[in-house]
Amino acid sequence: ATKLTEEKYELKEGQTLDVKCDYTLEKFASSQKAWQIIRDGEMPKTLACTERPSKNSHPVQVGRIILEDYHDHGLLRVRMVNLQVEDSGLYQCVIYQPPKEPHMLFDRIRLVVTKGFSGTPGSNENSTQNVYKIPPTTTKALCPLYTSPRTVTQAPPKSTADVSTPDSEINLTNVTDIIRVPVFN
């Protein structure tokens, strides 16, 4: 049975959440991946997704969310810049594999964003206030609209289990435009 576990990230407004979803299996490398928010009692909502097929080391930006898939490591990097208090919530990464239901990546992220000066980065957080320059070319997001009823949650149980590979998610308002972004160093 699948155990739904969470990993908590506590950050300040203006900071950047920078997490990785471990999709483990090579067969998922080219699969389209999505970042979803889970609100109690509702279907998970897709906020951003990679292209289909998912390209290696090819950043996609949707608003303040940046997704980058690293096939060589089996990891999807998810960044959310300029965090706001309203971004607080529960998130998950999934792999789209139609016609089957999305495959969930382990674990969920419980993001808590608080007001206050971001200060110096600690060993367990990234408080860099990066400003990403966005090129003018944009395309429409092509995220699948379906969500499996089996992924609907009542308030998911809060877990303190420290599990090996965090996954990642975040919140934003306008998810219509996907923007290709150069690699940031």
């Epitope: 997490v19 990785k20 089996g74 960044r79 382990f106 367990n124």
Partner: antibody, heavy 117, light 111 residues
Framework: EVQLVESGGALVKPGGSLRLSCAAS????????IHWVRQAPGKGLEWIGR????????KYDPKVKGRFTISADTSKNTAYLQMNSLKTEDTAVYYC??????????WGQGTLVTVSS | EIVLTQSPATLSLSPGERATLSCRAS??????????LNWYQQKPGQAPRLLIY???YRGRGIPARFSGSGSGTDFTLTISSLEPEDFAVYYC?????????FGQGTKVEIK
Amino acid sequence: EVQLVESGGALVKPGGSLRLSCAASGFNIDNTYIHWVRQAPGKGLEWIGRIDPAGGRTKYDPKVKGRFTISADTSKNTAYLQMNSLKTEDTAVYYCTGHYGGTMDYWGQGTLVTVSS
Amino acid sequence: EIVLTQSPATLSLSPGERATLSCRASESVDNYGISFLNWYQQKPGQAPRLLIYAAEYRGRGIPARFSGSGSGTDFTLTISSLEPEDFAVYYCQQSRHVPYTFGQGTKVEIK
């Protein structure tokens, strides 16, 4: 070509400190996790911990938590293992590794740490 | 923490023979439809090499004679026909829970 090179191994007295380095080439450590694993002479493998260099988030084996600290400098593409209050039982070859398939891959050649008076 | 127990401790075989190594976990290492159980090979004086990840998937450049199976708590590494370079120590390792843990190893030696 992906390569990890550990350095900093030395002979150190019990109670002493040491910092090991893990220099990566052929990939950006921002894009993966870096793990540290050790192997005492003639013994098995023991996972020490890992870091997500991009976010700085770390995880440790409880046996070393508080004494060992993993960090990374992404501008140098290098991860570090700071070891304090060293004990004789910390004598081992220390490896850094990259990440693949949900676990550790891309291993360095290892660096020997000897803790002895 | 999850304890991994490997058996046998030593396996004495000849080249061309089939090797079957076992790894048992103290609790399930399955989640999200994946078994987070991996196998490594280590030769003297060398770093370990990832052979099998997620119980059944071969690592990069690993020959087809290596295969993995199992789920939950019981796992097997099979080498269909031993080559001279396969004589080494094999470790299972779980990446389901922190701390990641390794088995004590199985030495495959020439008979």
